[in-house]
């Protein structure tokens, strides 16, 4: 059985609920015959605030005046202490400290949609720390009133559950919220509004887009709205953009023509609605419609470059390369490229459609004047063709750019600089900087990269398809009319010492000297552009320093003579390779003994 307060009572004056800062009187009194047996005057009553003693008194009752109680609930417990026994709980009381409610602020009401219900929100002000009841009252024309109550401590929202109708859109309604607790009450300022002020339309729905004759220039957006909507705002953007285009329209009646959309672009569209020019609020944005605009024929022209390779006395190989159009130029999916090759004097022409590649290689006679035209086609048409006359790009020595250099510029960039050609520099119409990975075999399958530079530029930063620790063959062409001059250099963006030395594969004797042949270091072990090879030799079983011969690196070279060996002496030979960062480890060692006669 619970025996709380069987032995006595705790009373609280003026009230269990007090204003912050108030004083409270707590009295603990024993009921008759409930004190310590035989020693009633020895009764020791102790008052605890939670678990801390705050007062005690011998006798049948105890009075305590308490101040400075914090906001919230404080527990007081009265206990009786008798000699030679544990303290006995007599009774307890909770005191609730709080404040009167502040005036509710910023009362605002809204009805979501023409069929929605009126709901209001407000700011409660500071926490009262007490149970506080909120009453929301709405009064309208013809003395109509509605009332809703909220008994939640944290109440700042109530829905009346009634629907305002547009019969008299200018009729005034007044809302007011009142907060009441044990310490006082307070009412908000009244909020007066009309139907048009508080109805927030539902967002538009069923959004569609139509392109007349599959053309981006004839595009209409359609949607559905609530009946009283007067204004709409549209926003749209390419799906990959963060910036919206905005359009405000009046009396659109669920349709609007858009005139500035880009072709072959996925757009996101949203619409919002409002009932009145200057009253009320905009609806939420509608759900997004995503749609791709139709293709249009490509604009712009392809950037085309080429490479010539001598095959034999009568034939040459032409490799054409071109860059993809930008998305804004392609204006659709490029289906194929059309390449036309024409001999200008004889008028012969051949045309080929190329899909899936941005290059084309053919063999043509070395005689005649040849031209090519390349265009890109999508489902709507073709770009304007880029025309190029095939010429010997390096033929005009006086047009060759001078003092070409290539220097690493940060990660995976190479800065190429040059001086204008000696011949009248103003004759240069443009420079082309071309680069490709250096392969000792001169492999024509290696991808070609290029960029065009204006005639007044004397430098270019190349970064496309540049990898660390790879050597690139870089050419700078100066073009003038039907003439061209070029200069080349090797360059890398990052280098270190080669991982291995060349492999000597043969040593042969020729007229008292030897010819050393070697295999090139694999490209992936060169670690940048090679500058030199070194050939080392010393007498077998000798502790002397080896002699060495340093040879400048040339792509095609893989043999070199040495004529300083003594006959009938066995030598050990090996090779290393050097980049600007240092020397490789030894390649393989070979022994050789020259058989020739002694001098």
């Amino acid at each position: 059985k619970i025996d709380a307060c069987k032995r006595g009572d705790v009373t609280v004056k003026p009230s269990h609920v007090i204003l912050l800062g108030s004083t409270v009187n707590i009295t603990c009194s024993l009921k008759p015959r409930q004190g310590c047996f035989h020693y009633s005057r020895r009764n020791k009553l102790i008052l605890y605030k939670f678990d801390r003693r705050i007062n005690f008194h011998h006798g049948h009752s105890l009075n305590s005046q308490v101040t400075g109680l914090p906001l919230g609930t404080t527990l007081f417990v009265c206990k009786l202490a008798c000699i030679n026994s544990d303290e006995i709980q007599i009774c307890g009381a909770e005191i609730f400290v709080g404040v009167a409610p502040e005036q509710p602020q910023n009362l605002s009401c809204i009805q979501k949609g023409e069929q929605g219900t009126v709901a209001c929100t407000w700011e409660r002000g500071r926490d009262t720390h007490l149970y506080t009841e909120y009453t929301l009252q709405l009064s309208g024309p013809k003395n109509l009133t509605w009332q809703k109550q909220c008994k939640d401590i944290y109440c700042d929202y109530l829905d009346f559950g009634i629907n305002l109708t547009p019969e008299s859109p200018e009729s005034n309604f007044t809302a007011k919220v009142t907060a009441v607790n044990s310490l006082g009450s307070s009412s908000s300022l009244p909020s007066t509004f009309t139907f048009l002020d508080i109805v927030r339309p539902l967002p538009p729905w069923d959004i569609r887009i139509k392109f007349q004759k599959a053309s981006v220039s004839r595009c209409t957006l359609y949607w559905r709205d609530e009946g009283l909507v007067l204004l709409n705002r549209l926003r749209y953007r390419p799906s990959n953009s963060r910036l919206w285009n905005m359009v405000n329209v009046t009396k659109a009646k669920g349709r609007h023509d858009l005139l500035d959309l880009k072709p072959f672009t996925e757009y996101e569209f949203q619409i919002s609605s409002k009932l009145h020019l200057y009253k009320g609020s905009w609806s939420d944005w509608s759900e997004s419609l995503r749609a791709q605009t139709p293709e249009e024929e490509p604009t712009g022209m392809l950037d085309v470059w080429y490479m010539k390779r001598h095959i034999d006395y009568s034939r040459q190989q032409i490799s054409l390369f071109w860059k993809n159009l930008s998305v804004s130029e392609a204006r659709g999916k490029i289906l194929h490229y059309q390449v036309t090759l024409q001999e200008l004097t004889g008028g012969k022409a051949m045309t080929q459609n190329i899909t899936g590649h941005t290059s084309w290689t053919t063999v043509i006679p070395r005689t005649g004047n040849w031209a090519v035209a390349v265009s890109a086609a999508n489902s709507k048409g073709s770009s304007l063709p880029t025309r190029i006359n095939i010429m010997n790009l390096c033929e005009a020595g006086l047009l060759a750019p001078r003092q070409v250099s290539a220097n690493s510029e940060g990660m995976d960039n190479i800065l190429v600089t040059w001086q204008p050609p000696r011949k009248d520099p103003s004759a240069v119409q443009e420079y082309v900087v071309e680069w490709r990975e250096l392969h000792p075999g001169g492999d024509t399958q290696v991808p070609l990269n290029w960029l065009r530079s204006r005639p007044y530029n004397v430098s270019a930063l190349i970064s496309e398809n540049i990898k660390s620790y790879i050597c690139y063959e870089i050419r700078v062409y100066a073009l003038s009319g039907d003439q061209g001059g070029c200069s080349s250099i090797l360059g890398n963006s990052k280098h270190k010492a080669p991982l291995s030395g060349p492999h000597i594969n043969a040593i042969t004797e020729e007229k008292g000297s030897i010819l050393i042949s070697w295999n090139s270091i694999p490209v992936q072990e060169q670690m940048g552009c090679l500058l030199h090879y070194r050939i080392y030799w010393k007498e077998r079983d000798s502790n002397s320093q080896p002699q060495l011969c340093e040879i400048p690196y040339r792509v095609s070279q893989n043999s070199h003579p040495i004529n300083s060996l003594q006959p009938r002496v066995t030598y050990v030979l090996w090779m290393t390779a050097l980049t600007a960062a240092g020397e490789s480890s030894h390649g393989n060692e070979r022994e050789f003994c020259l058989q020739g006669k002694a001098n």
Epitope: K1, A4, C5, H16, F50, T73, E94, Y131
Partner: nanobody
Framework: QVQLQESGGGLVQTGGSLRLSCVAS????????MGWFRQPPGKEREVVAT????????YYADSVKGRFTISRDGAKNTLYLQMNSLKPEDTAVYYC??????????????????WGQGTQVTVSS
């Protein structure tokens, strides 16, 4: 009128847990003691746990001490009983009760309280 509506009862194995809830409507019980009572089959109603209006003081019957926890949420006008390590002898109809008088610290066995309809808790072995 005042209503107390219990929920959360059910069938559970020995050693299992349940959480009972009691939602009060019709008046606020923020100042009133509330509690849980139970009536095992064929026995009298007995107190399980009570809690003061401000939630600062709780009482538990000896048979449930250390296993059951009573709590309340004034904002939601809701009383809870978390029951862990349930035993077959906890099988009973559990009733929610609220004091008709504000500011008292606890409910008494035979006091004049508001009562709920009860929710069945069955603990099977």
């Amino acid at each position: 009128q005042v209503q107390l509506q219990e929920s959360g009862g059910g069938l559970v194995q020995t050693g299992g847990s349940l959480r009972l809830s009691c939602v009060a409507s019709g008046r606020t019980f923020n100042w009133s003691a509330m509690g849980w009572f139970r009536q095992p089959p064929g026995k009298e109603r007995e107190v399980v746990a009570t809690i003061s209006g401000g939630g600062t003081s709780a009482y538990y019957a000896d048979s449930v001490k250390g296993r059951f926890t009573i709590s309340r949420d004034g904002a939601k006008n809701t009383l809870y009983l978390q029951m862990n390590s349930l035993k077959p002898e906890d099988t009973a109809v559990y009733y929610c009760a609220a004091d008709r008088v504000d500011y008292r610290m606890t409910l008494t066995q035979n006091g004049n309280h508001y009562w709920g309809q009860g929710t069945q808790v069955t603990v099977s072995s």
